[in-house]
């Protein structure tokens, strides 16, 4: 039985700001080479016949629910991409990560500025600090790591700060194992 | 309250290896970074690197990087700096600090007693 | 050579006031990264003195003050104590060496 398709993120964040590229790919295993691609955005067909489909210069418009389908196969799982427009962008590699598993954030500045004394914050209190932009990088998420993220920074000498992001962090399934 | 506490002092030959230690209580010592500052002797303050527990997100100093490693064990809240191939001008007090977040400043607010290291053949 | 430059020795006698200054660049006090003082007596552990230009930590007394102009900062003290003897360091952070930075250090003598 085929595997239901994955779609990815290159670059891996799902908040961009406008005018930014992301390319969105459809994996999956089991699809034959010349097989083309059906990609929904909001519900409806998109004409990209690619694996990737490619968002060049992301608009407001561009937000919202993408999927995609190989053949008749089932469509993806959906992702959600939501495009800003501000100062500062706390972007991370997942919004709902299964523990154990990485997670990554960053605080983006808009047009790659330069951010410095960059602060995070989870649940309200400061939780790393540097003198210039820098990132939160867990290798094994716990469920501790669950909370309400933002980030504030410097930028041309001014002060900003993100809009909030909520991380969560779920158990794993517990492997069943059967009686034979 | 707020304690590093570090490991004693040491005496090497040159070449041998060395790891010390900085052992933070009073404050949850994964959310804040840990420094190491060098004191040579009748020299002053140097800035070696730093070590944020929480996601091991290291920076070294211009004159440390491939020097040292900084490295922490976040479960028993310590901090260490370690060489591979210790050198005579590695003799020097060796310091601890945790870099906090106040009022907006980013300061080190807390030192340990350093730990003083002897390289002599 | 430390990136922050402060004199090697200032003395004073019991009551006077001394300045020690930290002279940087445009890359560290210039760029507005808060500078920071440190007061250091042989065989304890560096005590934060003033942080953020001008502030004190509890229990640092009023006659310790900073001041920052450009692209330096002075550490004031005044009515000088005995137990002031010390070695004192500025502290702050250099953009172009992507590093935190440390003056060299000034030994206050008590006459």
């Known amino acids: 039985v085929p595997q239901k398709p994955k779609v990815s993120l290159n670059p891996p964040w799902n908040r961009i700001f406008k005018g930014e590229n992301v390319t969105l790919t459809c994996n999956g295993n089991n699809f034959f080479e010349v097989s083309s691609t059906k990609w929904f955005h909001n519900g409806s067909l998109s004409e990209e016949t690619n694996s990737s489909l490619n968002i060049v210069n992301a608009k407001f418009e561009d937000s919202g629910e993408y999927k995609c389908q190989h053949q008749q196969v089932n469509e993806s799982e959906p992702v959600y991409l939501e495009v800003f427009s501000d100062w500062l962008l706390l972007q991370a590699s997942a919004e709902v990560v299964m523990e154990g598993q990485p997670l990554f954030l960053r605080c983006h500045g808009w047009r790659n500025w330069d951010v410095y004394k960059v602060i995070y914050y989870k649940d309200g209190e400061a939780l790393k600090y540097w003198y210039e932009n820098h990132n939160i990088s867990i290798t094994n998420a716990t469920v501790e790591d669950s909370g309400t993220y933002y980030c504030t920074g410097k930028v041309w000498q001014l002060d900003y700060e993100s809009e909030p992001l909520n991380i969560t962090v779920i158990k794993a399934p517990r492997e069943k194992y059967w009686l034979q | 309250e707020v304690q590093l506490v570090q490991s004693g002092a040491e005496v090497k030959k040159p070449g041998e290896s060395l790891k010390i230690s900085c052992e933070g209580s009073g404050y949850r010592f994964s959310s804040y970074w840990i420094a190491w500052v060098r004191q040579k002797p009748g020299k002053g303050l140097e800035w070696m690197g730093i070590i944020y527990p929480y996601d091991s997100d290291t920076k070294y100093g211009p004159s440390f990087g491939g020097q040292v490693t900084i490295s922490a064990d976040k479960s028993i809240n310590t901090a260490y700096l370690e060489w591979s191939s210790l050198k005579a001008s590695d003799t020097a007090m060796y310091y601890c600090?945790?870099?906090?977040?106040?009022?907006?400043?980013?300061?080190?607010?807390?030192w340990g007693l350093g730990t003083l290291v002897t390289v002599s053949s | 050579q430390s990136v922050l430059t402060q004199p090697s020795s200032v003395s004073g006698a019991p009551g006077q006031r001394v300045t020690i200054s930290c002279t940087g660049s445009s890359s560290n006090i210039g760029a507005g990264y808060d500078v920071h003082w440190y007061q250091h007596l042989p065989g304890t552990a560096p005590k934060l003195l003033i942080y953020g230009i001008n502030i004190r930590p509890s229990g640092v007394p009023d006659r310790f003050s900073g001041s920052k102009s450009d692209t330096s900062a002075s550490l004031a003290i005044t009515a000088l104590q005995a137990e002031d003897e010390a070695d004192y360091y500025c502290?702050?952070?250099?953009?172009?060496?992507?590093?935190?930075?440390f003056g060299g250090g000034t030994k206050l003598t008590v006459l």
């Open positions: 502290q702050s952070y250099d953009s172009s060496l992507r590093s935190v930075v």
């Open positions: 600090a945790r870099l906090a977040l106040i009022r907006g400043s980013i300061i080190f607010d807390y």
